[in-house]
């Protein structure tokens, strides 16, 4: 999906008001310095692409994020504020959500959510030059 036509300010508002809090809750008990940010993004559409990938695509060691509250809220925000956010995209993540039986918070998942926090912070500051 091409995120170019999303209403970025509305997505940012959804992030600031609710998604960010859920990410913090998920990471509670973890030191902010515990993980290095290895995933980056260059502009808002790119950030959303990376955010979607990390949130909904299962990775080795972390296959359960799609069931988390921050993931459901992310999906809702994209469904509302990204015109034509593909039905197949939502259906695919819906299927993944149904396929997972339990929520397991592994260290790999914590690292992945730490990366997500970094991507969202970058999304919120689009005018900053890439490090």
């Amino acid at each position: 999906y091409d995120f170019t036509n999303c209403d970025f300010e509305k997505i940012k508002a959804a992030y600031l008001s609710t998604i960010s809090k859920d990410l913090i809750t998920y990471m509670s008990g973890t030191k902010s310095t515990e993980f290095n940010n290895t995933v980056s993004c260059s502009n808002r559409p790119h950030c959303l692409t990376e955010i979607q990938s990390l949130t909904f695509n299962p990775t080795a060691g972390c296959a359960s994020l799609a069931k988390e509250m921050f993931a459901m809220k992310t999906k809702a925000a994209l469904a509302i504020w990204c015109p034509g956010y593909s039905e197949t995209q939502i259906n695919a993540t819906q299927a993944m959500k149904k396929a997972r039986k339990s929520k397991v918070t592994t260290n790999k998942c914590l690292e992945q959510v730490s990366q997500l926090q970094g991507l969202w912070r970058r999304f919120n500051r689009p005018l900053l030059k890439q490090q």
Epitope: C6, D7, A14, S17, T18, K73, A76, G84, E87, Q94
Partner: antibody, heavy 120, light 111 residues
Framework: QVQLVQSGAEVKKPGSSVKVSCKAS????????ISWVRQAPGQGLEWLGV????????IYAEKFQGRVTITADTSTSTAYMELSSLRSEDTAVYYC?????????????WGQGTLVTVSS | QSALTQPPSASGSPGQSVTISCTGT?????????VSWYQQHPGKAPKLMIY???KRPSGVPDRFSGSKSGNTASLTVSGLQAEDEADYYC???????????FGGGTKLTVL
């Protein structure tokens, strides 16, 4: 069972406000969008706006911006629609409708409708 | 923000097929696959018959089908039955400024 139950008919004076409620049961209220749609006598359907409690997002149709307020109480699974500065043209049946989870623009469940009559 | 355009009326005999059109623009019907159709009997709430322009919710007879070409969506009712007599409304997602548009409605009469 899965349903939306709306509050009863209202008769209002021009210039006043009306608040209609819509109680959901049988499904996880917060995940869906609850839209409000109205139908004037003998006329077509008109979308007023939607609330998605999961993300606390409310969107209003441009025509009703500033005059309509949609809220939701997730503890009671109830959505509300308040329309202010009523005029005779606002006489209509007001429906709440559930937008499918993440497909908020397909209304797969409707309330029974609330007739709002605006008359002096 | 004008409504989608539907013919005010359509009719057919029992057993026949009838097609109702719904014309929009590239900003709504033409731009997305998010077209839905609703059936409304007098004094009743609307009922979802078609969504995503050609999908049927469970419980809707397969006599009802949807299609889309360019800026126009269509609802076809085949094997008309007396209970199909109702008003039919199309609706389309219209982007993040307008969101939802409805057609003016088509009264389907079974002769």
């Amino acid at each position: 069972q899965v349903q939306l139950v709306q509050s009863g008919a209202e008769v209002k004076k021009p210039g006043s406000s009306v608040k209609v409620s819509c109680k959901a049961s049988g499904f996880t209220f917060g995940s869906y969008g609850i839209s409000w749609v109205r139908q004037a006598p003998g006329q077509g359907l008109e979308w007023l706006g939607v609330i998605v409690p999961l993300v606390g997002v409310t969107i209003y149709a441009e025509k009703f911006q500033g005059r309509v307020t949609i809220t939701a109480d997730t503890s009671t699974s109830t959505a509300y629609m308040e329309l202010s500065s009523l005029r005779s043209e606002d006489t209509a049946v007001y429906y709440c409708a559930r937008g499918q989870e993440y497909f908020y623009w397909y209304f797969d469940l409707w309330g029974q409708g609330t007739l709002v009559t605006v008359s002096s | 923000q004008s409504a989608l355009t539907q013919p005010p009326s359509a009719s057919g005999s029992p057993g026949q097929s009838v097609t109702i059109s719904c014309t929009g623009t590239s900003s709504d019907i033409g731009g997305y696959n998010r077209v839905s159709w609703y059936q409304q009997h007098p004094g009743k709430a609307p009922k979802l018959m078609i969504y995503e322009f050609n999908k049927r919710p469970s419980g809707v007879p397969d006599r009802f089908s949807g299609s889309k070409s360019g800026n126009t969506a269509s609802l076809t009712v085949s094997g008309l039955q007396a209970e199909d007599e109702a008003d039919y409304y199309c609706s389309s997602y219209a982007g993040t400024d307008i969101f939802v548009l409805f057609g003016g409605g088509t009264k389907l009469t079974v002769l």
